[in-house]
Interface confidence: low
């Protein structure tokens, strides 16, 4: 990484001290949680045509909506919507103004969390929304995946691979109409088997900005432009997941 943190990025964007931005990072305890060994379908060969990819979205057996995230200010705790059909606003019905007040974070209950895990994003994602995932990479890990989903589509697939042809690489992509698009690959790899991590994804008007362990890692231009339709984040892979939350900054 280039030691460029999201904090630095925001400092130059008219918000030098954004609300909800932690002052000291890396001190959160790493959680230990049971990982059921679920794997993501398919290996995503880098050079294969779209037909080689599995036609289904990432595993659907996510637990229901989480409860209130501990540590959030009492008035701002968001318990999450009910799970199941109709739980999310339909296309063309953006959430009400102020649906994401800057008082979060909202999200997962106290860890550890069961992986794969689903974090609902009831109003979709919006610029200046910060998603934070804390956890520990399992020993001998093979992969991690974050999937920002719009129905069956994956608007942003963030996929660190620990051993792709004996190399460590991060692959980002988008799945539309049941097919994967062009991969964007990043050889900077800040994850280590057995070690805790913090992933932060900041939604910007034109892209997602990703930082790992407080250092800027990459950005991914929006291919799905209707951000309000990106209504959940799937977290999967070889990790013990401590928490997953979001806040507005």
């Amino acid at each position: 990484a280039d030691n460029f943190s999201l904090h630095d990025a925001l400092s130059g964007s008219g918000n030098p001290n954004p609300q909800g931005w932690p002052g000291a990072w890396g001190n959160q305890p790493a959680g230990a949680g049971g990982y059921p060994g679920a794997s993501y379908p398919g290996a995503y060969p880098g050079q294969a045509p779209p037909g080689a990819y599995p036609g289904q979205a990432p595993p659907g057996a996510y637990p229901g909506a989480p409860g209130a995230y501990p540590g959030a200010p009492a008035p701002g705790v968001y318990p999450g919507p009910p799970s199941g059909p109709g739980a999310y606003p339909s296309s063309g019905q953006p959430s009400a103004t102020g649906a994401y007040p800057a008082t979060g974070p909202y999200g997962a209950p106290a860890g550890p969390l069961i992986v794969p895990y689903n974090l609902p994003l009831p109003g979709g994602v919006v610029p200046r929304m910060l998603i934070t995932i804390l956890g520990t990479v399992k020993p001998n890990a093979n992969r991690i995946a974050l999937d920002f989903q719009r129905g069956n589509d994956v608007a942003f697939h963030f996929n660190p691979r620990f051993n792709e042809n004996n190399r460590r690489v991060i692959v980002c992509n988008t799945k539309l109409d049941n097919n994967w698009g062009r991969e964007e690959r990043q050889s900077v790899f800040p994850f280590e088997s057995g070690k805790p991590f913090k992933i932060q994804v900041l939604v910007e008007p034109d892209h997602f900005k990703v930082a790992v362990n407080d250092a800027h890692l990459l950005q991914y231009n929006h291919r799905v432009k209707k951000l309000n339709e990106i209504s959940k984040l799937g977290i999967s892979g070889d990790i013990d997941l401590t928490s997953a939350s979001y806040t507005m900054i």
Partner: antibody, heavy 117, light 110 residues
Framework: EVQLVESGGGLVKPGGSLRLSCAAS????????MNWVRQAPGKGLEWISS????????YYADSVKGRFTISRDNAKNSLYLQMNSLRAEDTAVYYC??????????WGRGTLVTVSS | QSALTQPASVSGSPGQSITISCTGT?????????VAWYQQHPGKAPKLMIY???YRPSGVSNRFSGSKSGNTASLTISGLQAEDEADYYC??????????FGGGTKLEIK
């Protein structure tokens, strides 16, 4: 055999309505996003609408927005296009098309809609 | 939702190679979205010839190839044959979940 068969085309007066149907067979219909694409006589192809497998996401070209409605019945393996307030410029062959991110891989033979007084 | 730009016509002799260009913007062709190419003979439905910028569906001759650079995609047909005479259309997905077609290119075999 993967197949799409359109029906419902015909002659209609300006301002009138028509409902097109598309019967799908040979594949798991609900797994695929579907489209309507049209082609005016002697002109190029124009995408006009798409609908996701679950019907949750629906999109239209500006030229038909507010007048046309796409829908599907996965139990019947059928795609529909309800066309209201038809205009002369809507005269075209209408194709039912299966889509993927990479391309529209299965096309019906088309049904002709003629809007004329 | 403006159309992608293609030449109205191209021509070539049997055995030659031709290239048809398709120019869009960063919102479609250049925006990491995949370009597809279709062949249409008179009175027939379009047929997918190239998808995912450069992949051929099974059954399509390897004389057809696709590529993309920046905001421009290209279809190359080598070893032209009489049956290649047809209209060719490019298409791209856009970030707004719509699709956009090129205006079409008529290929004439001399």
């Amino acid at each position: 055999e993967v197949q799409l068969v359109e029906s419902g085309g015909g002659l209609v007066k300006p301002g009138g309505s028509l409902r097109l149907s598309c019967a799908a067979s040979g594949f798991t219909f609900s797994n695929y996003n579907m489209n309507w694409v049209r082609q005016a006589p002697g002109k190029g192809l124009e995408w006009i609408s798409s609908i996701y497998g679950s019907s949750r996401y629906i999109y239209y070209a500006d030229s038909v927005k507010g007048r046309f409605t796409i829908s599907r019945d996965n139990a019947k393996n059928s795609l529909y296009l309800q066309m209201n307030s038809l205009r002369a410029e809507d005269t075209a062959v209408y194709y039912c098309v299966r889509s993927s991110y990479g391309g529209m891989d299965v096309w019906g033979r088309g049904t002709l809609v003629t809007v004329s007084s | 939702q403006s159309a992608l730009t293609q030449p109205a016509s191209v021509s070539g002799s049997p055995g030659q190679s031709i290239t048809i260009s398709c120019t869009g913007t960063s919102s479609d062709v250049g925006g990491s979205y995949n370009v597809a190419w279709y062949q249409q003979h008179p009175g027939k439905a379009p047929k997918l010839m190239i998808y995912y910028d450069s992949y051929r569906p099974s059954g399509v001759s390897n004389r057809f190839s696709g590529s993309k650079s920046g905001n421009t995609a290209s279809l190359t047909i080598s070893g032209l044959q009489a049956e290649d005479e047809a209209d060719y259309y490019c298409s791209s997905y856009t970030g707004y979940s719509t699709r956009v077609f090129g205006g079409g290119t008529k290929l004439e075999i001399k």
